[in-house]
């Protein structure tokens, strides 16, 4: 049967993002409609047809446009994505002979990790704190010269959709750690980034 090929996209917050649909059919559609999937019913965003050209719904006027004006291949572009744009979008190709054929492309918004790494001496111990804030939630690991060092992790979700993961390394004999390198590893979207800290006696 006739189908629509789509691809999900993951883009960084406050950057442009494009979603594309391709109608796998010998013929073009009569009209293409893009809708945002919502809990109750989908919301019309924009249509393209030979008769009327591009018609953008008021709520999306300054947010999107159709950047590939095709009736077989259609691309919408968000100029500057926000967290509200995350979700799934339907492209509907109204075809002669086969009615409305739809595809779904999902947009995921990510925020690159912001990482802070610092340490603090107390009388008999050393705390090294590594905090990473990102979307989706990052993971924090430690690479230390010796084993058996305890750590504690706290996760905090923010109203803006990001998540902070804070891990504290508790070192009982801080003298042993002076001059040595501690590595905080942040895992985000499959990429591990190392943040290095050498402990100096203050």
């Amino acid at each position: 049967q006739v189908q629509v090929v789509t691809q999900d996209e993951r883009e960084q917050l406050y950057t442009p993002a494009s979603l594309k649909c391709s109608l796998q059919n010998a013929q073009e559609a009569l009209i293409v409609t893009w809708q945002k999937k919502k809990a109750v019913s989908p919301e019309n965003m924009v249509t393209f047809s030979e008769n009327h050209g591009v018609v953008i719904q008021p709520a999306y006027k300054d947010k999107i446009n159709i950047t590939q004006l095709g009736l077989q291949n259609s691309t919408i572009t968000f100029w500057n994505i926000t967290l509200e744009d995350e979700g799934c979008y339907m492209c509907l190709f109204n075809t002669f002979g086969f009615g409305k054929i739809s595809g779904t492309a999902c947009l995921t918004v990510y925020v690159q990790p912001i990482v802070s790494l610092h340490y603090k001496f107390s009388e008999d111990h050393l705390n090294i704190t590594c905090s990473a804030t990102a979307r989706p939630a990052p993971m924090v690991f430690w690479k230390v010269p010796r084993s058996g060092i305890e750590n504690s992790t706290v996760t905090l979700s923010h109203p803006n959709g990001t998540t902070s993961v804070t891990s504290i390394l508790h070192i009982k004999d801080p003298k042993n750690q002076v001059g040595k390198e501690v590595i905080c590893q942040v895992l985000h979207l499959g990429t591990v980034t190392d943040f290095k800290q050498t402990v100096n006696k203050g």
Epitope: Q24, A26, Q27
Partner: antibody, heavy 117, light 107 residues
Framework: QVQLVQSGAEVKKPGASVKVSCKAS????????ILWVRQAPGQRLEWMGH????????NYNLKFKGRVTITRDTSASTAYMELSSLRSEDTAVYYC??????????WGQGTLVTVSS | DIQMTQSPSSLSASVGDRVTITCKAS??????LSWFQQKPGKAPKSLIY???RLVDGVPSRFSGSGSGTDFSLTISSLQPEDFATYYC?????????FGQGTKLEIK
Amino acid sequence: QVQLVQSGAEVKKPGASVKVSCKASGYSFTDYIILWVRQAPGQRLEWMGHIDPYYGSSNYNLKFKGRVTITRDTSASTAYMELSSLRSEDTAVYYCARSKRDYFDYWGQGTLVTVSS
Amino acid sequence: DIQMTQSPSSLSASVGDRVTITCKASQDINSYLSWFQQKPGKAPKSLIYRANRLVDGVPSRFSGSGSGTDFSLTISSLQPEDFATYYCLQYDEFPYTFGQGTKLEIK
């Protein structure tokens, strides 16, 4: 030049099946939908269904309750319409046509199918 | 199914006359309507598609208009070869359906 040439007239008994062919020439067969329309004596035209030869996807008028099957042979640039369980009211002229989207431009000459006991 | 009702069912006119045939859909069909001309014993011939677009090779005296539920086909100046039966077709929704036809006869 573009041509759609249909098979010849048929006389069938009630309950039998008929298969009408529509041979296309003068264009790329897979670029156009082939549709089938019939016209009983003194009646309006009636849409039966159509096929996209590129993928072989077809769509039918449910009025025919599964009695109609539209197929194609791309190597022979030919579309077929088979109607089964024939009854007297299926006596009609059967036409094939091609369309690019909703743009119909060429039609076959028609095939008279007579259903009679 | 969407019902397509043409009017009039038959019409007598003279060469040079301006004639209009109407087609009414039982529900909104946007602009998804075609017009066909058929002569006795012949296959239909396409005239208009998408309500108002002229098929290549069709004389400019033929024009179509309308959207939603009400459509019309106008022949601005009848020629002898225009006497035939005219059908409308909706293709907004399956099954695609034709009007009952309008027979245009010489007065």
